[in-house]
């Protein structure tokens, strides 16, 4: 079995590697404002700009728990949002060039890119000191859906440059005195 | 699918080291702390400590303090556990497990039997 | 270290039975309690942490509970796969340990 997503107790879901991440809505989590890899966003359409379209990537900053402890420090993640739509041209089946139009195949906002980040834990009671290892999504990017496909086999939008490993998981732990540093971000 | 294939049995003589293997597949290693945990014959589980592959950092039991240390090659998923001046009492079966934390232990290796005999 | 004491050490049921097992901390560990189940020959495999957290794909018959010093794995309905051994382990303080084991029989 591999890893699934994670309910560390009744108040979040931590997502499972090889899952895409939808975290819940929480108190102490704050949106951002969307990001296109520091791009404005652009509508998936827009005939001027022949650049590959990306969709957008929300920023959300929250503090994970595990049982009745809680991070540290609050993490930032991304979810990966928005419509995905072609902004560049693509050959038909003649030769031609032409854009996708809204009826043709369906595009999906997912993720990209991953990294791992290392929790520092807070417990109750003067417990050891605890760690745990998180995946969070990087960056986020569209993937086309054919009809001759069902729904989850995605198609690459484009070229990509890294592709998240698949069937793998996270999840966290308790932390070494010789650690000091609190968090470890590592794109992957 | 996560999985952790560990090194075939070993005999040691006392006073000897030994290194199993653990090669980890369905996720990356460096994504997960690595715990080491050991049986002895119809005994109960010790846990022996754990690692963390990314930056290296390790936490061992008292016990096995200056005896064990954890590696890992990240480049090829495998974990590493080596303990040194080996006794009789050092015979038992010797658990690979993973996690996303420091102190539970998600998935388990097969095990490896290692015997101390002179 | 924090010592766990199990109870009992073996005990013999039958299919379908409620079966309860104790784990007793030497200190208080607060929540930080997990259960594992062993078959002969085979490695542990978790089953609740957080003292009362089910890890994934763990059948909804086991179920435990407790806080400070007392905890408690019940099997709501042993199952002819549910024979073996189970262990709670501690990580409130270093170093992790775990209770001597509690061995669940066919009667």
């Known amino acids: 079995q591999g890893w699934q997503a994670f309910r560390n107790d009744a108040t979040e879901v931590i997502p499972g590697l090889g899952e895409y991440p939808e975290p819940p809505p929480e108190n102490n989590q704050t949106m951002n404002r969307a990001e296109n890899g520091g791009r404005p966003p652009h509508h998936p359409y827009d005939a001027k700009d022949v650049s590959e379209y990306s969709c957008r990537e929300l920023h959300y900053t929250r503090f994970l728990t595990d049982g009745p402890c809680r991070s540290a420090k609050p993490v930032t993640e991304l979810v990966c949002s928005g419509q995905c739509g072609p902004a560049r041209l693509l050959p038909n089946a003649i030769g031609r060039v032409k854009w996708w139009r809204p009826n043709g195949p369906d595009f999906r906002c997912i993720p990209d890119r991953y990294r791992a980040q290392r929790v520092q834990l807070l417990c109750p009671g003067g417990a050891a000191p605890r760690s745990r290892k998180v995946r969070l999504v990087a960056s986020c990017k569209c993937k086309r859906l054919t009809r001759f496909h069902n729904q989850s086999e995605l198609k690459d939008f484009g070229p990509e440059t890294a592709r998240p490993q698949k069937g793998r998981k996270p999840r966290p732990g308790a932390r070494g005195a010789k650690a000091n540093q609190a968090e470890l971000e590592n794109a992957y | 699918q996560v999985q952790l294939v560990q090194s075939g049995a070993e005999v040691k003589k006392p006073g000897a080291s030994v290194k199993v293997s653990c090669k980890v597949s369905?996720?990356?290693?460096?994504?997960?702390?690595q715990h080491w945990v050991r049986q002895a014959p119809g005994k109960g589980l010790e846990w022996m400590g754990w690692?963390?592959?990314?930056?290296?950092?390790?936490e061992y039991a008292s016990k096995f303090q200056g005896r064990v240390t954890m590696t890992e090659d990240t480049s090829t998923d495998t974990a590493y556990m080596e303990l040194s001046s080996l006794r009789s009492e050092d015979t038992a079966v010797y658990y690979c497990?993973?996690?996303?934390?420091?102190?539970?232990?998600?998935?388990w290796g097969q095990g490896t039997t290692v015997t101390v005999s002179s | 270290d924090i010592q766990m004491t199990q109870s009992p050490s073996s005990l013999s049921a039958s299919v379908g039975d409620r079966v309860t097992i104790t784990c007793k901390a030497s200190?208080?560990?607060?929540?930080?309690v997990a259960w594992y189940q062993q078959k002969p020959g085979k490695a542990p495999k978790l089953l609740i942490y957080?003292?009362?957290t089910r890890w994934t794909g763990v059948p909804s018959r086991f179920s435990g509970s407790g806080s400070g010093t007392d905890f408690t794995l019940t099997i709501s309905s042993l199952q002819p796969e549910d024979f073996a051994t189970y262990y709670c382990?501690?990580?409130?303080?270093?170093?992790?340990?775990f209770g001597g084991g509690t061995k669940v029989e066919i009667k």
């Open positions: 690692s963390d592959p990314e930056i290296g950092d390790t």
């Open positions: 957080w003292a009362s």
């Open positions: 369905g996720f990356p290693i460096k994504h997960h702390f």
């Open positions: 382990q501690q990580y409130s303080d270093y170093h992790w340990t």
């Open positions: 497990a993973t996690g996303d934390t420091t102190y539970k232990f998600d998935f």
């Open positions: 200190q208080d560990v607060h929540t930080a």
